[in-house]
Interface confidence: low
């Protein structure tokens, strides 16, 4: 199923609009904003996810920003053009065509410059750092159950191939989930690591994509994990290309 | 080919301080923690630290929080360690080593640290 | 912290033997688990990662299994350059550790 045929939802996007006009009346899904077929067995890219919700005004809030020691989404939301299969296009401008390159997770990795600036290639981000800082608890989490739950979280809600997960390392009150995936390790029907650190970073924010489902109620033995800042640091196979005076 | 080389063996007085470099080439520097494991003559592996060179998040071994700094040059792809109020059993060579979330895979030649009166 | 322990310390054995080192982890950590081999003067390299990924260029002898507490690196038929000593690091939380180290003499 590509959709709930029940009642024609989409339950790993509420973003969407779906109707039974598919093959043989099946249920099919659009993505809001672009009005792209999505797939409703697996997470919708991030792409299509950003232009969804530029699509609907009362989404008018920023991104975290943290320091630009890192690759760090510090330009906040923008309007996307995505490629046929829903993935970043290189190059994104914007309305005063003002363009910039990204990377495969849609964050900018150059200055600015006009409608003259070439991006060659959409640069994979191969490794996301989610940093998290949970609010006081009785005491720390224990590590291992820590790690458990929250593999277990990527692998069954976001559908994360085990594997991707590459660490979870605690030290009170900060946590660091490491999700690495190279070109090569991507198989066809696999997450990306992209598209599951965003549902993830919305599902903390309270601002859960799935359809219908309650919000994200992370515990780790019965404890609530309550998460009160999180930070993400994405990491490119080609090294992101800012002048110095970005860096100063 | 990824490589890391460090500097050149020391010889410091009890109490003194020791820096020691890590320079790192053939890889994306900024991409992979570098750890620091040190070894005293005739025994095992202990792991000082690490340093996350993108963004200089470090963590530190409890047993040397209070003597030892991790820092990184991104401009020279270069990580340092310095140890202070240097002791008799500081002495060990001190091994770089990078980690991809997939074990130790490439180290440093290792520096020889002498602490003697 | 997390404490690895080796055993046995030594394994004396012949070449062509099979070899069979054991590290355990005081609690569970998954599959956490990375061996290396350390030769005199020389730095550790790394065997297995991830308690069962073969590293790229490693002979095929060397094998890793395991999970939980308790971890296993086999040699199957050790060649005379195998004699060595070899460390099980966890990085399952920090503070990284290793363990105690088993060294492989010649019998």
């Known amino acids: 199923h590509t959709a709930a045929q029940d009642n024609c939802t989409c339950p790993t996007n509420k973003m969407t609009v779906c109707s039974p006009d598919g093959p043989g009346g099946r249920c099919q899904c659009r993505a809001l904003g672009s009005g792209m077929a999505v797939d409703c067995s697996t997470l919708t890219s991030k792409c299509l996810l950003l232009k969804a919700r530029m699509s609907a005004p009362k989404n008018a809030r920023t991104l975290v920003r943290p320091s630009e020691h890192a690759l760090v989404d510090n330009d906040g939301l923008y309007d996307p053009d995505c490629d046929p299969e829903g993935r970043f296009k290189a190059r994104q401008c914007n309305q005063t065509s003002v363009c910039w390159c990204v990377n495969s997770v849609g964050v900018r990795r150059t200055d600015k410059g006009d409608l003259s600036l070439r991006c060659d290639e959409l640069v994979r981000t191969h490794h996301i750092l989610i940093d998290l800082r949970h609010r006081p608890t009785a005491g720390a989490f224990n590590h291992s159950d820590l790690d458990a739950e929250l593999r277990r979280l990527f692998r069954e809600r976001y559908r994360l191939h085990p594997k991707f997960v590459a660490a979870v390392h605690y030290e009170q009150p900060t946590i660091q989930i490491e999700l690495r995936q190279n070109t090569s390790q991507k198989a066809a029907g696999d997450v990306d690591i992209g598209d599951a650190a965003y549902y993830f970073e919305r599902d903390i924010k309270g601002e859960s994509l799935f359809q219908g489902r309650g919000g994200l109620d992370l515990r780790v033995r019965g404890e609530p994990l309550q998460v009160e800042r999180t930070l993400i640091y994405y990491l490119d196979e080609i090294p992101p290309k800012f002048s110095m005076k970005r860096l100063t | 080919e990824v490589q890391l080389v460090q500097s050149g063996a020391e010889v410091k007085k009890p109490g003194a301080s020791v820096k020691v470099s890590c320079k790192a080439s053939?890889?994306?520097?900024?991409?992979?923690?570098i750890n620091w494991v040190r070894q005293a003559p005739g025994q095992g592996l202990e792991w000082m630290g690490n340093?996350?060179?993108?963004?200089?998040?470090?963590n530190y071994n409890q047993k040397f929080k209070d003597r030892v700094t991790m820092t990184r040059d991104t401009s020279t792809s270069t990580v340092y360690m310095e140890l202070s109020s240097l002791r008799s059993e500081d002495t060990a060579v001190y091994y770089c080593?990078?980690?991809?979330?997939?074990?130790?895979?490439?180290w440093g030649q290792g520096t020889l640290v002498t602490v003697s009166s | 912290e997390i404490v690895l322990t080796q055993s046995p310390a030594t394994l004396s054995l012949s070449p062509g033997e099979r070899a069979t080192l054991s590290c355990r982890a005081s609690?569970?950590?998954?599959?956490?688990i990375h061996w290396y081999q350390q030769k005199p003067g020389q730095a550790p390299r790394l065997l297995i990662y991830?308690?069962?990924e073969s590293i790229s260029g490693i002979p095929a002898r060397f094998s890793g299994s395991g999970s939980g507490t308790d971890f296993t690196l086999t040699i199957s038929s050790l060649e005379p350059e195998d004699f060595a000593v070899y460390y099980c690091?966890?990085?399952?939380?920090?503070?990284?550790?290793f363990g105690g180290g088993t060294k492989v003499e010649i019998k």
């Open positions: 609690q569970n950590i998954g599959t956490s």
């Open positions: 340093i996350y060179p993108s963004n200089s998040y470090t």
């Open positions: 991830f308690a069962s």
């Open positions: 053939g890889y994306t520097f900024t991409s992979y923690w």
């Open positions: 080593s990078s980690y991809r979330s997939d074990g130790f895979a490439y």
């Open positions: 690091q966890q990085s399952n939380s920090w503070p990284f550790t």
